[in-house]
């Protein structure tokens, strides 16, 4: 499900206001508002499943819900890649796959989802309280990452609720692209609406309720998303490799996390639930965007063992050729 701004239906402006605001400034808000409503926030979902046949074997499935083209997917465990996490696999939509133990088989399931089977034996094998993270680099959205883990109480063959502990992070590449333009547009629209609200409007009928107040609230970050700005990633990992830092932040800048409540209704039951569409993490675009400007000096994100991602505005096809001079 895409996260979209829910905006009440707008009433046409009063005739008396048209002269005050001007025809041009009246048209612009409606255009921008349409953009804001339809510019759904991209999301990443993660689903972790323990295989019934091999008790210590896991399958991780991740997907990206966004309109952009995916340029790279990085799967890590023990936390996000670059924040104490260890890369398990890197999947490129044209170039292929690099994977690392205990990954047994990484593959693309669809153009926007991947799966990764982890081996169940050996010193580096996962266990039930391991956190697995999927990071999707896409254009124009930037990088979005979500994490999930299998609850220790889970029965074999059952999967964890999708994305129990998502991370909502967009890198500058996406923010400064289309998303930035949309954000600017939305802020400008909000400014216009506020001006509109505070402007005296003697011709307005007293019985009519002004729609501006709820409209303004539509863009304000929710309490949940505001709280997410201050929650660092923390994993207490006592029995699993790799060991994870108590509090870890991605290199080069802060990260914002949201821990969503897990409802019993979200827990899939048996194979039918495994096949059903996972419920993605929901998040406010504002809560993600606020922290990005601190990362302006950050170098391109490291995307795996010996792998460097060079975002390409032309999408994954453009990445077939050389990516840049080392």
């Amino acid at each position: 499900m895409r996260t979209e701004a829910q905006v009440p239906a707008l009433q046409p402006p009063e005739p008396g206001l048209e002269g005050a605001m001007g025809h041009r400034t009246l048209v612009l808000p409606w255009v921008l508002l349409t953009l804001c409503v339809t510019a759904g926030t991209p999301e990443v979902w993660v689903q972790v499943r323990m295989e019934a046949t091999e008790l210590s074997s896991f399958t991780i499935r991740c997907g990206f819900l966004g309109s952009g083209s995916i340029s790279l997917v990085t799967v890590s465990w023990g936390g996000p890649n670059g924040a104490g996490g260890t890369t398990l696999a890197v999947l490129h939509p044209e170039r292929g796959i690099r994977q690392w133990a205990p990954a047994r088989q990484a593959r693309w399931e669809t153009q926007s989802s991947i799966s990764l089977i982890l081996e169940g034996s050996g010193a580096s094998s996962p266990c039930a309280n391991t956190t697995f993270c999927c990071k999707f680099a896409s254009f124009p959205e930037g990088s979005w990452e979500a994490c999930g883990s299998l609850p220790p109480s889970s029965d074999p063959g059952l999967s964890a609720p999708p994305t129990p502990a998502p991370i909502l992070r967009a890198d500058l590449a996406g923010i400064l692209g289309v998303s930035g333009v949309l954000l600017f547009g939305c802020v400008y629209l909000l400014h216009l609406l506020r001006r509109h609200k505070h402007r005296p409007a003697p011709r307005l009928q007293p019985s009519r309720t002004s729609p501006q107040a709820p409209r303004a609230r539509a863009w304000a970050p929710s309490q949940a998303s505001q709280a997410a700005l201050h929650v660092p990633y923390a994993t207490i990992n006592t029995s699993c490799r790799p060991a994870t830092l108590d509090t870890a932040h991605p290199h080069g800048g802060p990260s914002w996390w949201a821990s969503l409540p897990t409802h019993a209704a979200h827990r899939p039951q048996g194979p039918a639930a495994w096949a059903s569409t996972p419920i993605p993490a929901r998040g406010s675009f504002v809560s993600v965007e606020n922290g990005l400007y601190a990362q302006a000096g950050e170098r391109p994100p490291h995307t795996g063992p010996g792998l460097t991602l060079f975002p390409d505005p032309r999408g994954p096809r453009a990445m077939e050729g050389p990516l840049g001079v080392r």
Epitope: T86, T87, H92, P93, E94, R95, G96, I97, R98, Q99, W100, A101, Q105, A106, R107, G304, P305, G306, L307, T308, F310, E320, G321, P322, L323, G324, R326
Partner: antibody, heavy 119, light 107 residues
Framework: EVQLQQSGPELVKPGSLVKISCKTS????????MDWVKQSHGKSLEWIGA????????SYNQKFKGKATLTVDKSSSTAYMELRSLTSEDSAVYYC????????????WGTGTTVTVSS | DIVMTQSQKIMSTSVGDRVSMTCKAS??????VAWYQQKPGQSPKALIY???NRHTGVPDRFTGSGSGTDFTLAISDLQSEDLADYFC?????????FGGGTELEIK
């Protein structure tokens, strides 16, 4: 100039083990993964596995799991491959190959090590 | 495992000719193909990466093309130093697999 200098030929007995080396120079060792490839009968090539020198993470072809073990020594910029429980099927030329992760291919190959298993 | 089939085991050619060799993948591997040249008694050398990009120092007589399952390495104005074995490699999925090789020989 980037070079991958491998250790000399090995003549070993069945059931024994051998450890071959790949000494690198001309680049930063930890910046590139090192893969290993087997060439039998002077023709067919098989990918054995890879190692990330930065953290020692490994990846193996299932066929070579239990047969090959990949390690690195960062201090000497050297990659190693140990082959155990050797049989005549393991007689081959073994290559280390540097994996270019910007362009996704083996851009430089080692000199090759011939392993002959014979009683 | 993905099977890479180089159907022409040996190709007889003459200096100055243009020759094309093929590599067929058992499934769609997008552009995840590289080509290597190996002369007798030597290590393989990189020629082409990501289907169509020439490795540093490789003459433009060598051209790679294709996508999906069918890939081609073409050599124009064949030189005597081009006589060698040529292998394709797929890195789309694990384990990475090579083609059986095509040997270029003089007629």
């Amino acid at each position: 100039e980037v070079q991958l200098q491998q250790s000399g030929p090995e003549l070993v007995k069945p059931g024994s083990l051998v450890k071959i080396s790949c000494k690198t120079s001309g680049y930063t060792f930890t910046d590139y993964n090192m893969d290993w490839v087997k060439q039998s009968h002077g023709k067919s090539l098989e990918w054995i596995g890879a190692i990330d020198p930065k953290n020692g993470a490994t990846s193996y072809n299932q066929k070579f799991k239990g047969k090959a073990t990949l390690t690195v020594d960062k201090s000497s910029s050297t990659a190693y491959m140990e082959l155990r429980s050797l049989t005549s099927e393991d007689s081959a030329v073994y290559y280390c190959a540097r994996w270019d992760s910007n362009y996704w291919y083996f851009d430089v190959w080692g000199t090759g090590t011939t392993v002959t298993v014979s009683s | 495992d993905i099977v890479m089939t180089q159907s022409q085991k040996i190709m007889s050619t003459s200096v100055g000719d243009r020759v094309s060799m093929t590599c067929k993948a058992s499934q769609n591997i997008r552009s995840a193909v590289a080509w290597y040249q190996q002369k007798p008694g030597q290590s393989p050398k990189a020629l082409i990466y990501l289907t169509s990009n020439r490795h540093t120092g490789v003459p433009d007589r060598f051209t790679g093309s294709g996508s999906g399952t069918d890939f081609t390495l073409a050599i124009s104005d064949l030189q005597s130093e081009d006589l060698a074995d040529y292998f394709c490699l797929q890195h789309w999925n694990y384990p990475y697999t090579f083609g059986g090789g095509t040997e270029l020989e003089i007629k």
